[in-house]
């Protein structure tokens, strides 16, 4: 029942702490304005990592101070999270809301487990 969002099960962050994945949602066909929210689940707690509203014709834009960037194409959103550290390892859930025009739809992905491995410090050279 309702709209579903699909996202990969697992993603490994780069050594620079950057992780990217695609969040795809079932489109109702007439959504002009979409809101995408990235949530991080730790235990039973959900915290918002970043969010953006975009019009279907435009590219996705996150707030300047955001840890996320993204681009959109049709019913697919390519999300990139930056500045990840090992402590940032966790389940990242993509929430998509078709905000306008009515009707409102919401879809939640099952989550992408992002693994972040902090790079080993370079050994001192003599």
């Amino acid at each position: 029942k309702g709209m579903h969002a699909a996202q990969p099960a697992v993603v490994l962050a780069s050594s620079r702490g950057v992780a990217s994945f695609v969040c795809e949602y079932g489109s109702s066909g007439n959504a002009a304005e979409v809101r995408v929210t990235m949530l991080r689940q730790a235990g039973s707690q959900m915290t918002e990592v970043c969010a953006a509203t975009y019009t279907v014709e435009d590219e996705l834009a996150f707030l300047d101070d955001s840890t996320c960037t993204g681009t959109s194409s049709g019913n697919k959103v390519n999300l990139t999270i930056q500045g990840l550290r090992a402590m940032g390892t966790g389940l990242y859930i993509c929430k998509v809301e078709l905000m306008y025009p009515p009707p409102y739809y919401v879809g939640m992905g099952n989550g992408t487990q992002i693994y972040v491995i902090d790079p080993e410090p370079c050994p001192d050279s003599d």
Epitope: M99, Y100, V106
Partner: antibody
């Protein structure tokens, strides 16, 4: 804390005009499409009008088309509802609502009676 | 006249579980459109307790849950508390009316 505060409700005569305002705070107003929902004792709840985040596109329920105009000023974090040619059946409490139904204002009462 | 049908009232004892039904048609609830549920106390605005069929906004206790089957949506409140005594409304989009439709509300009384 998200707050939506409606003002402008009044006792009006049929055929009159009224403008409701809703001042938003506690969230990025310009990122959200917004709606006006009314609640009348006999008619229950009804979504009256909606507007997209930029203000360029609007939606109206048939009962108010051509009489009501929804607009917004993102610089002032304010949503408006201009109500013209008021009818008895427009009597209701009018709520300002974020379009994903997450938050409602406290409402403002509009009474239309001769 | 509300398009979604709800029982006018339901009652249950403190700590018990209660369900409130919201019956529509193939053009609204049965058409796969998201269902919302609202709680309203006298003289107060509605508060959304379920959006998108089964999602709870933050701050809403997990005692509140919802499901949809066919043309009927159901709100379940378990472990009833005195503060749950209120009016409950459902809503959904109706494709034939191209408008949101609401239930007429159900008054929950805690015994």
């Amino acid at each position: 804390e998200v707050q939506l505060v409606e003002t402008g409700g009044d006792l009006m005569k049929p055929g009159g005009s009224l403008r409701l305002s809703c001042v938003a705070s506690g969230f990025t107003f310009s990122s959200y499409s917004m709606s006006w929902v009314r609640q009348a004792p006999e008619k229950g709840l009804q979504l009256v009008a909606g507007i997209n985040s930029g203000g360029s596109s609007t939606y109206y329920t048939d009962a108010v088309k051509g009489r009501f105009t929804i607009s917004r000023d993102n610089a002032k974090n304010t949503l408006y509802l201009q109500m013209n040619s008021l009818r008895d059946e427009d009597t209701a409490v009018y709520y300002c609502v974020i379009s994903n139904w997450s938050y409602w204002g406290q409402g403002t009462l509009v009474t239309v009676s001769s | 006249q509300p398009v979604l049908t709800q029982p006018p009232s339901v009652s249950a004892a403190l700590g018990q579980r209660v369900t409130i039904s919201c019956t529509g048609t193939a053009t609204n609830v049965g058409g796969g459109y998201d269902v919302q549920w609202y709680q309203q106390f006298p003289g107060r605005p509605p508060k959304t307790i379920i959006y998108g069929n089964y999602n709870r906004p933050s701050g809403v206790p997990d005692r509140f849950s919802a499901s949809t089957s066919g043309t009927t949506a159901t709100l379940t409140i378990s472990g009833l508390q005195a503060e749950d005594e209120a009016n409950y409304y459902c809503s959904s989009w109706d494709n034939s009316l191209t408008a949101y439709v609401f239930g007429s509300g159900t008054q929950l009384t805690i015994l």
